[in-house]
Amino acid sequence: VTEHVLANNDVSCDHPSNTVPSGSNQDLGAGAGEDARSDDSSSRIINGSDCDMHTQPWQAALLLRPNQLYCGAVLVHPQWLLTAAHCRKKVFRVRLGHYSLSPVYESGQQMFQGVKSIPHPGYSHPGHSNDLMLIKLNRRIRPTKDVRPINVSSHCPSAGTKCLVSGWGTTKSPQVHFPKVLQCLNISVLSQKRCEDAYPRQIDDTMFCAGDKAGRDSCQGDSGGPVVCNGSLQGLVSWGDYPCARPNRPGVYTNLCKFTKWIQETIQANS
């Protein structure tokens, strides 16, 4: 099985859907935005629903200019985001407190520059292990009902735990349909054995699988976005099968409980 992550670096958004073979794995980032075309094979939460407004105040969008969303991210500190390492770009902008995908101004939004991006040193492109990165913002956020950090869980997830994943990734696969507003999806953590059975020789303890049997899944464009379980940040959208939401092919997420020490130490060393 060839691997494919859920960020799409083909930001021209004209990547034909037939260039990624069915049954391959894909990074879940994307070139989503005003000019996203319906034949782009990247980015989505499948079979989710519109998030309630103000319920995901830690959700961030990483934007290429002019306003093209390519990955999600999570506010974990007043001046720091977490996202997937495979979402790293040298020039990007950060949007917080925004509900719709379109760049239309929203009163709760706050815009930032990333002044430093620090991938986990154990990440290896184009692999999936240690798929996380810290981004330092150019200033501290102004805490509001729309913009607020979330704590990273130090407890590893157990099978059956109910979680919420969110993002602006495409809502269909393999065809593409980008949502108007932030999508939310309830998923359940799977056992590590089920995860390894789904993706033999591709899973390690820096990852966990989650999904359900009803064809619900995250997908490209959602990369780097949050998986929240019991009120704390448990994972980041990382990779999965293509097309998304295939039976017995769950989404794969960065297992943040393994990285709490690195996250804390890196923020402290660079603050």
Epitope: L64, A85, K89, V91, K116, P119, P121, Y123, N138
Partner: antibody, heavy 117, light 110 residues
Framework: EVQLQESGPGLVKPSGTLSLTCAVS????????MSWVRQPPGKGLEWIGD???????DYASWAKGRVTISQDSSKTQVSLKLSSVTAADTAVYYC???????????WGQGTLVTVSS | AYQMTQSPSSLSASVGDRVTITCQAS??????LAWYQQKPGKAPKLLIY???TLASGVPSRFSGSGSGTDFTLTISSLQPEDFATYYC????????????FGGGTKVEIK
């Protein structure tokens, strides 16, 4: 056509200030980070610093306090100033564009600056 | 501080040879490594970025591998136009860096 063109005085006196500009054409500076790199005669490449569209600037540790990198408001050129120059600053100076994946994909032809009295 | 060390500093090879150049980082730089080719009197040219991604227009005889601290540039079958100096550059961090580039490897005709 995507192009970078460095220009500036070829000769600078010791203790003076080296000033170079890099004219950018064929792409918007607002989408890319730009780097300055130099190469002393017969030696390897030395990174000087990067400037981002947001005007965030990273400098090599040896360059802090001596180097100023800037870009004009119309975003069509990038500038480099190096103060208190010595003979050791004699080099070919290049500007280059980052491809947004941490590779310098477009380079100027370079301009030789000699520090001598 | 992150330091990049290239080896060998020079090598002699013949057309058709397989050539390998290594670059070692003093600390892990994950996969943020680029390789450049420079010919005398010319600006460097990007060959590979993200350790293994071939830049546009670069022949497939060039390949890059490695992650963490150890990286390799391989030319599978050396061509006459490949005699040049090759540099690696880390893109992991710009904080407290003296130089992002390695010292270079000159590939000469045997």
């Amino acid at each position: 056509e995507v192009q970078l063109q460095e220009s500036g005085p070829g000769l600078v006196k010791p203790s003076g200030t080296l000033s170079l500009t890099c004219a950018v054409s064929g792409f918007p500076l607002s989408n890319y980070a730009m780097s300055w790199v130099r190469q002393p005669p017969g030696k390897g490449l030395e990174w000087i610093g990067d400037i981002y569209p947001s005007d965030i600037i990273d400098y090599a540790s040896w360059a802090k306090g001596r180097v100023t990198i800037s870009q004009d408001s119309s975003k069509t050129q990038v500038s480099l100033k190096l103060s208190s120059v010595t003979a050791a600053d004699t080099a070919v100076y290049y500007c280059a564009r980052d491809n947004n994946d941490y590779g310098l994909d477009i380079w100027g032809q370079g301009t030789l600056v000699t520090v001598s009295s | 501080a992150y330091q990049m060390t290239q080896s060998p500093s020079s090598l002699s090879a013949s057309v058709g040879d397989r050539v390998t150049i290594t670059c070692q980082a003093s600390q892990s730089i994950s996969s943020w490594l680029a390789w450049y080719q420079q010919k005398p009197g010319k600006a460097p040219k990007l060959l590979i970025y993200l350790a293994s991604t071939l830049a546009s227009g670069v022949p497939s005889r060039f390949s890059g591998s490695g992650s963490g601290t150890d990286f390799t540039l391989t030319i599978s079958s050396l061509q006459p136009e490949d005699f040049a100096t090759y540099y690696c550059q880390q893109g992991y961090t710009n904080s407290n860096i003296i130089n992002t580039f390695g010292g270079g490897t000159k590939v000469e005709i045997k």
